[in-house]
């Protein structure tokens, strides 16, 4: 049977002297930028590990998949990919590991087909609230983005400009309500301590949310109720101690959800009873048989599914007169 997938093709490396010779002219349709490899058949351009300091100006108009990974871009200015004619076919853009520390408002404007954007492994000290929406209007034109990969974009502590990193990222996600169509959001490995309570409610199309390898301690103030189409929720490798009834009920109410909870420091005391009961009954937690207690010491490495109510006690709180320091 026929398929819409492109055939694999060999990449053509451009000759640097040729590129520089024509840089003052409009790019030729099949031209390949210096230090890049291009395959028109696969509609792919790869400018990988070349220490580029800016986005090539002479990208071929046919490009559908653009890899600009492992460079030294530092800043993405407004209209970084705006071209005449526009890169109308560009659907997947990977900028991971390119030492970006600033992404300015409108950096991805004039990319009408951009569906997948990966900014992972860049120390984004300054992510404009309007990086994805392109304007400061209260309601922007909808972004075509379907997948946004922002894993490990937290900058070093000393570069965080005395503001909440979580807040900066969330502001960019919510600005102008441009990302209403976003289906996959990855925010792994960002040292998040909390999840601002309004973020999920304003991303109603989410199917996949990856918050793994952060420092989330609690989900008490996070509501999943609006995410009726959520299919996978990754919460592995956080600092979660227990999930409370409200969260359990919300997760259970999502018809297709798969939740991943491995490697959290579960506290197996009396507050864990509801979660243990829920785990024994639910099908939404993948790998639930791997979940183990971290605290208290006497419960360490016990499997949550094997606990019963008698195991889950809390030390009685002594009246002040009987407490010892």
């Amino acid at each position: 049977s026929s398929s819409p997938t492109s055939s694999a093709s060999s990449f053509s490396s451009s000759a640097p002297f040729l590129a520089s010779a024509v840089s003052a002219q409009p790019p030729l349709p099949d031209q390949c930028p210096a230090l890049c490899e291009c395959s028109e058949a696969a509609r792919t351009v790869k400018c990988v590990n070349r220490n580029l300091t800016e986005v090539p100006t002479d990208l071929p108009a046919y490009v559908r998949n653009l890899f600009l990974t492992g460079n030294q871009l530092a800043v993405l200015p407004a209209g970084a990919f705006a071209r005449r004619p526009p890169l109308a076919e560009l659907a997947a853009l990977n900028l991971s590991g390119s030492r970006l520390d600033e992404v300015r408002a409108g950096a991805f404007e004039h990319l009408p087909s951009l569906r997948q954007l990966d900014l992972s492994h860049n120390p984004l000290a300054d992510l404009s609230p309007f990086a994805f929406s392109g304007s400061n209007a209260s309601v922007s034109a909808p972004s075509p983005l379907v997948e946004l990969i922002l894993n490990h974009i937290v900058p070093p502590e000393d570069e965080r400009q005395n503001r909440s990193f979580e807040g900066m990222v969330v502001a960019a996600l919510l600005a102008g309500r441009a990302l209403q169509g976003l289906r996959r959001l990855e925010l792994a490995s960002n040292h998040f301590l909390y999840l601002p309570r309004d973020v999920l409610a304003q991303l109603p199309s989410l199917r996949h949310l990856d918050l793994s390898n952060n420092s989330l301690v609690s989900l008490t103030y996070v509501s999943f109720r609006n995410l009726t189409h959520l299919e996978s929720l990754h919460l592995e490798d956080n600092a979660l101690k227990v999930l409370h009834n409200g969260t359990l009920a919300e997760l259970q109410g999502l018809p297709h959800i798969r939740v991943f909870l491995d490697n959290n420091p579960w506290v197996c005391d009396c507050h864990m009873a509801d979660m243990v009961t829920w785990l024994k009954e639910t099908e939404v937690v993948q790998g639930k048989d791997r979940l183990t207690c971290a605290y208290p010491e006497k419960m360490r490495n016990r499997v949550l599914l094997e606990l019963n109510s008698a195991d889950l006690d809390c030390d009685p709180i002594l009246p002040p007169s009987l407490q010892t320091s």
């Epitope: 997938t5 997947a92 997948e147 199917r207 996949h208 996978s232 990754h234 798969r258």
Partner: antibody, heavy 124, light 107 residues
Framework: EVQLVESGGGLVQPGGSLRLSCAAS????????MNWVRQAPGKGLEWVGE??????????YYAESVKGRFTISRDDSKNSLYLQMNNLKTEDTGVYYC???????????????WGQGTLVTVSS | DIQMTQSPSSLSASVGDRVTITCKAS??????LSWFQQKPGKAPKILIY???RLVDGVPSRFSGSGSGKDFTFTISSLQPEDIATYYC?????????FGGGTKVEIK
Amino acid sequence: EVQLVESGGGLVQPGGSLRLSCAASGFTFSNYWMNWVRQAPGKGLEWVGEIRLKSDKYATYYAESVKGRFTISRDDSKNSLYLQMNNLKTEDTGVYYCARRRGYYGSAYGMDYWGQGTLVTVSS
Amino acid sequence: DIQMTQSPSSLSASVGDRVTITCKASQDINSYLSWFQQKPGKAPKILIYRANRLVDGVPSRFSGSGSGKDFTFTISSLQPEDIATYYCLQYDFLPLTFGGGTKVEIK
């Protein structure tokens, strides 16, 4: 050339079990969400379930009609997809197809390649 | 679950006729809709994806249109080899759901 070849179909009694396989070739199997779809004799197509990628921890999703009875698994090293069917019912009779789906939410295509199918008959 | 209501369930047309099939989704599925052709004893074959994009190698007499809830599949000039059952598929939401099919016959 992309190929999907199902096997393992046959006659089984109600309450019995069967394991279907789907051998994939001609593409990078590990990059695709893989699906099972079935078709009862003379009827339309019904989605059975899907398994995602290693990066998705091989998450599985099922139609309500097979939940708890069917299990989808995959072995990327063998380019193979499986469907373990337990507690089979007469209404599970039909041709079972495996089909691939691009492993990302911006995918344009839905299911673009299908196998030729394998017939499962559940009857006493 | 998204219901896909496909009509008509069968039709008979002459060679050269224009044939139109519709699929209506119970809620907005954007443009995440494919059309398939299935001949007796064969696997379904994808013809159209993203509601209106023709798969490479598929004859240009096949076309698709629509977005949101209402979609149309058209064969501009029916050929004898087009005798088959045609299905729509929505892949925006789980579970993935198919239309009931339209059997196309030659008069």
